[in-house]
Structures are given as C-alpha cells and as structure tokens.
Amino acid sequence: CKAMHVAQPAVVLASSRGIASFVCEYASPGKATEVRVTVLRQADSQVTEVCAATYMMGNELTFLDDSICTGTSSGNQVNLTIQGLRAMDTGLYICKVELMYPPPYYLGIGNGTQIYVIDPEPCPDSDF
C-alpha cells in the first residue's frame, strides 16, 4: 500500500497555562530526507492552518518565530506543543505529514486530536 499512516492521540487536555502537547507519529513508505509537518484545526467543515514546519531528517523541527507551535523530532515521531490556547480554541487538531523529498511525494493525515482548553478562574483579590 502506497499510503502513509499518521497516528496521534484522540484527546489531550491543555494545561491551565493554555499549553497542549501531543505526539504525531508517521509510518513512512519511503526514506524521506525532507519532511513537512502541519497542524490543522478543523471546525465544522472549515479547515485552517495553525502552524507548519519543514525539517531535514536528523535535524530539529523549526517553526517560524511568531508561531504558536514548537516541536522536536525523533525519527518518524514529532512531539508538538501548541501554546497560548484559550477555551475558544477547543477543537480538533489534525497532524498532517508530507514527505517532500526525495520523490515520490507522500501525504499523511491523522484522525485528529481533540484538544480541550479550560480558561483558568481569575484569582480573587486578596486583602492584606
């Protein structure tokens, strides 16, 4: 089968600081040297790009400076962290992996991770 399988957890709960981490693992049908990883958010039928990074196998994953994502890679596994999340960002986050080089190109799309974000309660004013 020439398809690429991508696995990611079904559910992740963001921390009280609005940080969510999950692993995206892909089964590569070829020996890729250049890989692109994209996090997509699906809400209803709308799909938007959250962040994307291209990396050379063996090197670190580098997102743009203004990205809300960070990540590390190890073999066919990518550890992704999304920060700055708020309750309104709760939703399905899809890991998309593309083997960009060498040919042929392969596309892999995970089933998505439902990230739940709960805004922290504001601290009550304390009198001293």
């Epitope: 089968c1 020439k2 398809a3 690429m4 399988h5 049908p29 250049e34 692109r36 994209t38 997509l40 799909v47 938007t48 790009e49 994307a52 291209t54 899809i94 998309k96 593309e98 960009m100 080089y101 040919p103 042929p104 190109y105 392969y106 596309l107 799309i109």
Partner: antibody, heavy 118, light 108 residues
Framework: QVQLVESGGGVVQPGRSLRLSCAAS????????MNWVRQAPGKGLEWVAV????????YYTDSVKGRFTISRDNSKNTLYLQMNSLRAEDTAVYYC???????????WGQGTLVTVSS | EIVLTQSPGTLSLSPGERATLSCRAS???????LAWYQQKPGQAPRLLIY???SRATGIPDRFSGSGSGTDFTLTISRLEPEDFAVYYC?????????FGPGTKVDIK
Amino acid sequence: QVQLVESGGGVVQPGRSLRLSCAASGFTFSSYGMNWVRQAPGKGLEWVAVIWYGGSNKYYTDSVKGRFTISRDNSKNTLYLQMNSLRAEDTAVYYCARVHLLGPFDYWGQGTLVTVSS
Amino acid sequence: EIVLTQSPGTLSLSPGERATLSCRASQSVSSSYLAWYQQKPGQAPRLLIYGASSRATGIPDRFSGSGSGTDFTLTISRLEPEDFAVYYCQQYGSSPFTFGPGTKVDIK
C-alpha cells in the same frame, strides 16, 4: 473569495515554447501547493505538475519531465508553467488548481487552451 | 503509479433516479486520499467529495461517497437536471497524482 485566472495559451508550432501563468487571489498563496492539470479535446483529466509552498519541491508526470517547468512567485501570487519542445499531444486546455489543506484540488481556474500545430 | 479505473463509462438515467459510479484502484489507496470531481461541458472540474466520503463546501447531500482499499463509490441519490455531467475520481496520497478516465452520466 478564491480566484485563479490562467493566461498565456494560444497556437504554437511543434518544438516551440510557451509560458502559461495563473494569477491567484483571495488566499495566502504561499501556504498552498499548486498544480497544473490538462485536458486534451474530448478526453479526461491528466495531472501535469505540482509545486509546493516555497517552490523548491516540484513533481511532474513522466510525459512532460525535462520539457516542462513549474514555478511560482509568491510575492506576485502567480503560478507558471514553462513548456518547451512542445508536441501535438500537448494540445489541451490547461487548468491551474489549488491543493486543499487536506489534499484534494479544491479550486480550479477556467483553463487556457494550448494548441500545438504546424 | 496508481491506476484508477472507472465504470461504467457511460450511465444513462432519468432525473429522479439513483446513480452509482464506481472507481477501482490498481493498488490500495487510503480512503483519506480519494476524491471525486464533477465536470460539465466547457467548465472546469468541481470538487465534490474528498477523503472518500467528506462533502466539499456547498455540495448538496444527495452526493455521497464511500469505499476503502481499492474500491470506491460515488452515489447520487436522486438525479437533478444539473447533475448530468462527467465524474472523475482521483487519488492524491502520493505522486504522481492520478485521475480515473471518467464516467459520463447522461439523460436517458
């Protein structure tokens, strides 16, 4: 709204060259892969080439390798197809098509006709 | 290269009838990477279904897709006059991306 407009088609003699353009608007051009797909008169769809994101990764169908070059200018939101050593069998309507974030081709231009004839 | 075969080549039906179009792949295609397009004369193709079964934006629910592995189906539950067209399947999971030869749905 997303719009793709092809131009540059016409009648050309075998062995000659032609450059097609596709002007894109209504989306962040550099975030999407872009394709050329062609359709010979009365025939089905044939994928020709794709170019990804920054433009360094390109793939072609075997029949055009070494003759056609796909490129993009993200600053101008424009996709190109340089066609050299044209043959009669390259006669077709050429469409540019955007790659949806999940992979299929979600938006297509209206097409531009290329006729290779002596 | 993944070769896609479509059947039948032509389907002659009346408005209101159900249309069942088949697409078969030469090797297994993940259902995540199979699409269906509609094309009318003189027009560009239009994306109908992606991921084998997800309807594209604005596509009416009379269009549905199913299948996995090497066998996929596009079903039009009740044909409307505007549905008479040519339908193509496509795999986009690996290059070269390939289209089937098409099925023409015409009026009986």
